[in-house]
Structures are given as structure tokens and as C-alpha cells.
Interface confidence: low
């Protein structure tokens, strides 16, 4: 009856970590003596190809400096402890604790037996690294320039993670890759630039990094920040503003990041009626004349800048009751 | 951080109907289920349904179908549960909750009380 | 609907223990299975999502194992803020069920 070794293709282990790299001897087989089990590197150099051996008196040794006995164990082969007890090799499942980078790379399990002579089989060995994400805004001032508004990193991640952006705004991403701190592994940041507009301030995006470690993609929503100038419109003219009419009001209705410092309220002729009272953002008009057949502008300050909007007053004779719907300057 | 905040405790007749409201902050609200999951007094916990707000698609429990109804409000980030002809073994610690990957995040339960 | 049975319904063990909890779901749900752990008063909080691995600020003390029906929640030295009502779920199939709960008391 054949026998062969049951091994993994390949097997993931995480940076510093320990890894199982399994190995068995099957079916068992009656009879079937295992003189010796050994571990090895074939692609290393030659003095670090014999990584463990496992020998059925004198039990484990481990010859090769890297990985090294401090770092290296058999889960569950057993050596003969007297007359009376076998050792147990069938499984030679090997644990190598502490991963590097270095410990990346081809094994070979390898059972010598009697009377069936040795058999192999071969384990890629991949060092894997989570990696820790991070994402935050960038408090920007809007320009007409693309500019960073938003980064996300992540940081050590081997292999490096993949950063991709979900947002409904008209963005681009750059990305830059360096070395982390641990060997081996890689920091990746993506920066999400746009032109900055107050379209997009408060807007949240949301930075996806997928990663092999992960069991999903990590998704970290980011609310953006740009500090723009006052985006001015004026509300409350309804086109039914008569003669000595009294409950008339225009709002200046504001959109600005940050909050606006001054509104001012003039009109275009020069000219400002006395019945018309500046309450902050609310023009107030105590009883509608004349002087009100003009435009009126509302002029909005912030730390960033200034902005303003215009609203063209018609004054009628008499109301109109045709029934005028409102509308915006 | 997230949060989910319910509304308060109920006392209904049988027969009659009750609507618990959950309201959802510290994350994108469209992006996850919201569960409901009950749990009777000394008793286990019962899944009811869920609602995914980003399309309003929803899923029952089939031993609650035609009693209940789950919804989501996006405007106020809000989720509902509402479970109509109640009986007496309705009466319960109503949770709403957030699937992540497992139930990562619970509302602080509402009692509904079922009793004439 | 997939049944989720648990066992023991009720556990006592003294602090430093090692506690196993077991569920058995009626059919095969692959490592869809999550453990949560129950105290008075408060929700359930999640310590265990797919099988095996352990949720964020969870202790290392807790882990779980198990695939397709057989799943174990393992407490490997119990401490007395363990003490708590400890569920299991599935969530391979629709509808999410739960197991009935283990009581885990301190002797």
C-alpha cells in the first residue's frame, strides 16, 4: 500500500506571529517504520537547507541558525521515552513562532521509511502582515486647485492593502507606497483630492481597504471639511409687493463654512428705503413705498470671504390677486 | 461613535398595534441592516427581521410575517418595527440592532408590555 | 428554520476554570456562527463572529472554534466578570436563529 504526505500547497502566517505548517504521513500503514523526519529550505542557501530534523530516539534538532531552535517546535511528533513506547512520528506538523520576512518560502517535509523509502511534499510559506487603517480629513480652504481633502492610510500591511474611494463627487485619488517600520511590510496612503467647493463640504466619502487578512473590506467614512465663502441667495419676495404693504420680509439665506461674521444690506441704487430695517440675516420692511422699485443686495462675511446675492423688487400699485407663487433671487 | 437610541417603553392592549422607533448616528445610516431582535422576559433572544435602509429592502421572520413591518426613514436616520394584532406573548425587550459582520451594535431594548 | 442547540443550558465553575460551551446547529452552516454574551439589564454584546474569531476588545481569554454543525465558545480561565448568559447564533440562513441561552454561574 502507497503511503503520502499530506501537506498544505501553501499556508498564511502573520508577521510575529506562529504558523502551523502541517505534515502527515498517511494512510498508516502496519509495520511501516519512520526512521527519520526532516524539514528543509530547498531554495536556501545550502548551510541553512536543513531546517529540523526529527529523529525517533534522540528526538528533535534543529540545525540551521535561521529559523533557528529558539524559534522552532514539532507540535506532536514524540520520541521514544524507553523500551516500551514508540515514537510518534506520522505527524511532523512543524510550528514556527516569531515570523519574519526571511522565514518566507518553500519547505520541504520529508519522511525516510522503511521499507517504502522517503517521501516528500512541499509547503509555500507566505508572511502575511495586517495592516492598521486610518483615515481622516483634511481642513482645506476652497481653491481652484485639486487638492488633498481627505487621507486615508494604511499602515504595515504586507502585502501592501488596496485603497479605493466610494463618492459621489468628482475626485481622484494619489497614491504613494514606503517601507514600514516593520521589514517587509508597506505603509499605503491614498489621498483624495478635488477641486474644494462648499458642494463638498460635510459630504462624507468613505475610504475601502481591502486586505487578505480581512475577512471584509475595512470601510472608514471620512466627512469632509472645506472652509469656503458665503454662498448667498435671498428668499421672501413673492412678486405681490404693493403700496403700503406691512408684512414683507427678505431673508438672506447663507451656505458658508465657517459661520458667516456680518451680513450688510444695501441696494443697487444707492438709495436705502427707511422703512427697511436690517435685522442680521432679515430685512424687515415696516410698510412698503416707492423707493422700494429697486434691488436690494445682501452682502455675507466670513473668515474666508464674502459673498452676495441680489433680489429685484417690483412694487405694484395695487395687490396682485391672481395669486403670484414666490420666488428666489 | 455609533449610536442607536430607542424610543421608549409600551403598554398595549391585545389586538392593537405597536411601532418602535430606533434612531441611528455615528455612521453611514444607509450603509448597514438594522435588525430587530426580541428577547420575552427570562427568555432567549428571537430574531424578527431587518431593513436596509440605503433601499428600504426588508426581511422577516416568516413566523412574524403579516405582523410586522420594517422600516427606515434616511431623512432622520431612523429605523421602525412595527408588530400589529398583539398577543400577550408579544410582551418583550424589543431590540434594534446593526449588522456589521455579526450584531456589533444594539439599541438599549424597548419593553413592550402586552396586557388588557 | 435551523434549530441551534446549545448545551449546557446552565454552567457553574469556579474562577480560573477552564469553561467550554457547546451549540449544535441542525444542518450544516458552514462558519457562520457568532457567540454573545448577555448580562442583566444590558444587550447582548458580541465576543465571537464566524466560528472562530474574536471581536474587537474582546479578552484573549475567549475564543471559539467549529465549522459546519458543531461549534465550541472556550473561556480558558474564567474570571467573575464572566458571569453572564452566553448565546449562540447563526447567521447562514434565513431566519437568523439563536441557541437558548447558557447560563454561566460562579460556584
Known amino acids: 500500500q502507497d503511503v503520502r504526505v499530506q501537506v498544505l500547497p501553501e499556508v498564511r502566517g502573520q508577521l510575529g506571529g506562529t504558523v502551523e505548517l502541517p505534515c502527515h504521513l498517511l494512510p498508516p500503514v502496519p509495520g511501516l517504520y519512520i526512521s527519520l523526519v526532516t524539514w528543509q529550505r530547498p531554495d536556501a542557501p545550502a548551510n541553512h537547507q536543513n531546517v529540523a530534523a526529527f529523529h525517533p530516539k534522540m528526538g528533535p534538532s534543529f540545525p540551521s541558525p535561521k529559523p533557528g531552535s529558539e524559534r522552532l517546535s514539532f507540535v506532536s511528533a514524540k520520541q521514544s521515552t524507553g523500551q516500551d513506547t514508540e515514537a510518534e512520528l506520522q505527524d511532523a506538523t512543524l510550528a514556527l513562532h516569531g515570523l519574519t520576512v526571511e522565514d518566507e518560502g518553500n519547505y520541504t517535509c520529508e519522511f525516510a521509511t522503511f521499507p517504502k523509502g522517503s517521501v516528500r511534499g512541499m509547503t509555500w510559506l507566505r508572511v502575511i502582515a495586517k495592516p492598521k487603517n486610518q483615515a481622516e480629513a483634511q481642513k482645506v480652504t476652497f481653491s481652484q486647485d485639486p487638492t488633498t481633502v481627505a487621507l486615508c492610510i494604511s499602515k504595515e500591511g504586507r502585502p501592501p492593502a488596496r485603497i479605493s474611494w466610494l463618492s459621489s463627487l468628482d475626485w481622484e485619488a494619489k497614491e504613494t507606497q514606503v517601507s514600514g517600520t516593520l521589514a517587509g511590510t508597506v505603509t499605503v496612503t491614498s489621498r483624495f483630492t478635488l477641486v474644494p467647493s462648499g458642494r463638498a463640504d460635510g459630504v462624507t466619502v468613505t475610504c475601502k481597504v481591502e486586505h487578505e487578512s480581512f475577512e471584509e473590506p475595512a470601510l472608514i467614512p471620512v466627512t469632509l471639511s472645506v472652509r469656503y465663502p458665503p454662498e448667498v441667495s435671498i428668499s421672501g419676495y413673492d412678486d405681490n409687493w404693493y403700496l403700503g404693504r406691512t408684512d414683507a420680509t427678505l431673508s438672506c439665506d447663507v451656505r458658508s463654512n465657517p459661520e458667516p461674521t456680518g451680513y450688510d444690506w444695501s441696494t443697487t441704487s444707492g438709495t436705502f428705503p427707511t422703512s427697511a430695517v436690517a435685522q442680521g440675516s432679515q430685512l424687515v420692511i415696516h410698510a412698503v413705498d416707492s423707493l422700494f422699485n429697486t434691488t436690494f443686495v445682501c452682502t455675507v462675511t466670513n473668515a474666508v470671504g464674502m459673498g452676495r446675492a441680489e433680489q429685484v423688487i417690483f412694487v405694484r400699485e395695487t395687490p396682485n390677486t391672481a395669486g403670484a407663487g414666490a420666488t428666489g433671487g | 461613535q455609533v449610536q442607536l437610541v430607542q424610543s421608549g417603553a409600551e403598554v398595549k392592549k391585545p389586538g392593537s398595534s405597536v411601532k418602535v422607533s430606533c434612531k441611528a448616528s455615528?455612521?453611514?445610516?444607509?450603509?448597514?441592516?438594522i435588525h430587530w431582535v426580541r428577547q420575552p422576559p427570562g427568555k432567549g433572544l428571537e430574531w424578527i427581521g431587518a431593513?436596509?435602509?440605503?433601499?428600504?429592502?426588508?426581511n422577516y421572520n416568516q413566523k412574524f410575517q403579516g405582523r410586522v413591518t420594517i422600516t427606515a426613514d434616511e431623512s432622520t436616520s431612523t429605523a421602525y418595527m412595527e408588530l400589529s394584532s398583539l398577543r400577550s406573548e408579544d410582551t418583550a425587550v424589543y431590540y434594534c440592532?446593526?449588522?456589521?459582520?455579526?450584531?456589533?451594535?444594539w439599541g438599549q431594548g424597548t419593553t413592550v408590555t402586552v396586557s388588557s | 428554520d435551523i434549530q441551534m442547540t446549545q448545551s449546557p443550558s446552565t454552567l457553574s465553575a469556579s474562577v480560573g476554570d477552564r469553561v467550554t460551551i457547546t451549540c449544535r446547529a441542525s444542518?450544516?452552516?458552514?462558519?457562520?456562527v457568532a457567540w454573545y454574551q448577555q448580562k442583566p439589564g444590558q444587550p447582548p454584546k458580541t465576543l465571537i463572529y464566524?466560528?472562530?474569531y474574536r471581536y474587537s476588545g474582546v479578552p484573549d481569554r475567549f475564543s471559539g472554534s467549529g465549522s459546519g454543525t458543531d461549534f465550541t465558545l472556550t473561556i480558558s480561565s474564567l474570571q467573575a466578570e464572566d458571569v453572564a448568559v452566553y448565546y449562540c447564533?447563526?447567521?447562514?440562513?434565513?431566519?437568523?436563529?439563536f441557541g437558548q441561552g447558557t447560563k454561566l454561574e460562579i460556584k
Open positions: 431593513v436596509y435602509p440605503g433601499n428600504s429592502d426588508s
Open positions: 455615528g455612521y453611514i445610516f444607509t450603509s448597514y441592516w
Open positions: 440592532t446593526k449588522l456589521v459582520g455579526t450584531f456589533d451594535y
Open positions: 447564533q447563526q447567521y447562514n440562513t434565513n431566519p437568523f436563529t
Open positions: 464566524s466560528a472562530s
Open positions: 444542518q450544516n452552516v458552514g462558519i457562520n
